[in-house]
């Protein structure tokens, strides 16, 4: 928008610096850390958000706890390399020249190696399983009401097309949300399931990336839905390549 006298901000990403220096005095916002321009009418990519998070002071939180079920983010935060579109580069390296391959959500999918490690392509994460445990309530939530509320959340807040929310499972107190999005299904302008899952994760942890209203107000028939634990599992279109040593 035009921001002649207004403070200029990005409603969908707190981790930005904005100024009215775009064409015609329009507000232009750039992600912290990378300096890349972001579209403030949609979600910012997870890669740019992680990079911004690493550039901000006093951030030492890990993402999700290790699990043996599927590919999970055991490595926690790192300062990623993003491509010009804001996606993760297939190969990531740290300052000590240790390198590894990642998937489209930035989770390591190979053993760590040196600078000779090759990552031929960015492998797409096509299935994300979000595993939640809610705080005790007087009774179990009605499954269909819970399903409707969570589908509505992903459609409205993260602008994720309803077809990408494959299922919502519920066995009190565990809720599982399945997001599925193949390369062939994702059209131009579609929100990526990895970005939606990351925004959701931050919302659930009380670290909303949105400005304005900010935090979530999840309710099922008026009853607050409060999450006390989150685990996120990532499944790639091509299985990860880890040595047998890691699997034992």
């Amino acid at each position: 928008h035009t921001a002649a006298q207004d403070n200029c901000t990005c409603p969908t990403n707190k981790m930005t610096v904005c100024s009215p220096d775009g064409p015609g005095g329009r507000c232009q916002c750039r992600a912290l850390g990378s300096g890349m321009a972001v579209d403030c009418s949609t979600l910012t990519s997870k890669c740019l958000l992680l990079k911004a998070r690493m550039s901000a002071p006093k951030n030492a939180r890990t993402l999700v706890r290790p699990s043996e079920h599927a590919l999970v983010d055991n490595d926690g935060l790192y300062d990623p390399d993003c491509d010009p579109e804001g996606r993760f580069k297939a190969r990531q390296c740290n300052q000590t020249s240790v390198c590894w391959c990642v998937n489209s959500v930035g989770v390591r999918r190979t053993d760590k190696g040196d600078l000779s490690l090759r990552c031929d392509e960015l492998v797409r994460t096509h299935h994300i399983l979000i595993d939640l445990r809610h705080r005790p309530t007087a009774g179990a939530f009605n499954h269909s009401d819970l399903d409707a509320e969570l589908r509505r959340l992903f459609r409205e807040r993260y602008r994720l097309h309803p077809k990408f929310v494959a299922a919502v499972h519920y066995e009190q107190p565990t809720i599982q949300i399945e997001l599925r999005q193949n390369t062939s299904q994702k059209a131009a302008g579609d929100v990526d399931i990895g970005d939606a899952a990351y925004y959701f994760e931050r919302d659930i942890k009380g670290e909303s990336l949105f400005q304005g209203r900010g935090g979530l107000d999840l309710r099922v028939r008026g009853e607050p839905l409060q999450v006390e634990r989150t685990l996120i599992y990532y499944l790639d279109e091509i299985p990860p390549k880890f040595s047998m040593k890691r699997l034992t």
């Epitope: 928008h1 403070n7 901000t9 409603p11 409205e156 979530l216 028939r221 008026g222």
Partner: antibody
Framework: AVTLDESGGGLQTPGGGLSLVCKAS????????MFWVRQAPGKGLEWVGV????????NYAPAVKGRATISRDNGQSTLRLQLNNLRAEDTGTYYC???????????????????WGHGTEVIVSS | ALALTQPSSVSANPGETVKITCSGG???YGWYQQKSPGSAPVTVI????KRPSNIPSRFSGSLSGSTNTLIITGVQAEDEAVYFC????????????FGAGTTLTVL
Amino acid sequence: AVTLDESGGGLQTPGGGLSLVCKASGFDFIDYDMFWVRQAPGKGLEWVGVINRSGSYTNYAPAVKGRATISRDNGQSTLRLQLNNLRAEDTGTYYCARGACTHCWDADSAGYIDAWGHGTEVIVSS
Amino acid sequence: ALALTQPSSVSANPGETVKITCSGGYSGYGWYQQKSPGSAPVTVIYWNDKRPSNIPSRFSGSLSGSTNTLIITGVQAEDEAVYFCGGYDSSPGYVGIFGAGTTLTVL
């Protein structure tokens, strides 16, 4: 059918307060954000404020901030606007409206209104 | 505060297609028809392109960038009214806002 019925308008004195009530029916009130919008005579629409479905969040236009309080009773399906320290420029028709996007990051947007009340007229004059 | 920009007036012959633009906000635009001052507005489009079930299909909405367009395909005499667009001011405060209104005259 969705019905929003405002009441409480009328002649008010400057410096005084008013309380407008909107009675909702025909939908699950607890599932929707609600707005107040007003229109001064011969002027355009003006967003007054919003309350989320649980009542835990409110936001107000700069022109009424500090003077307005929006509240709701989900059990009675009623929305209320309390406006104090009334001024002549508060004169107009006040509409209660329903928001269609309670989870949206920009849920305060006037662009999510999908239903309106008939309005109640407020005149602030001595 | 941010203002939404829309033309003050447009005119068309019956049966023609009318386009009214609204710009200056973020996604989350709506269009509201008011046939006379003080009468209750009627939502013709909300959330960029959603049409209430009681609104004729000749009304549609389209979002391109930060500009929303109300399209009336085959305008009719009863469509003559003032059309207000609604949106979102993303400068701190994050409030709802309306455009000044566009008067549609059907010739």
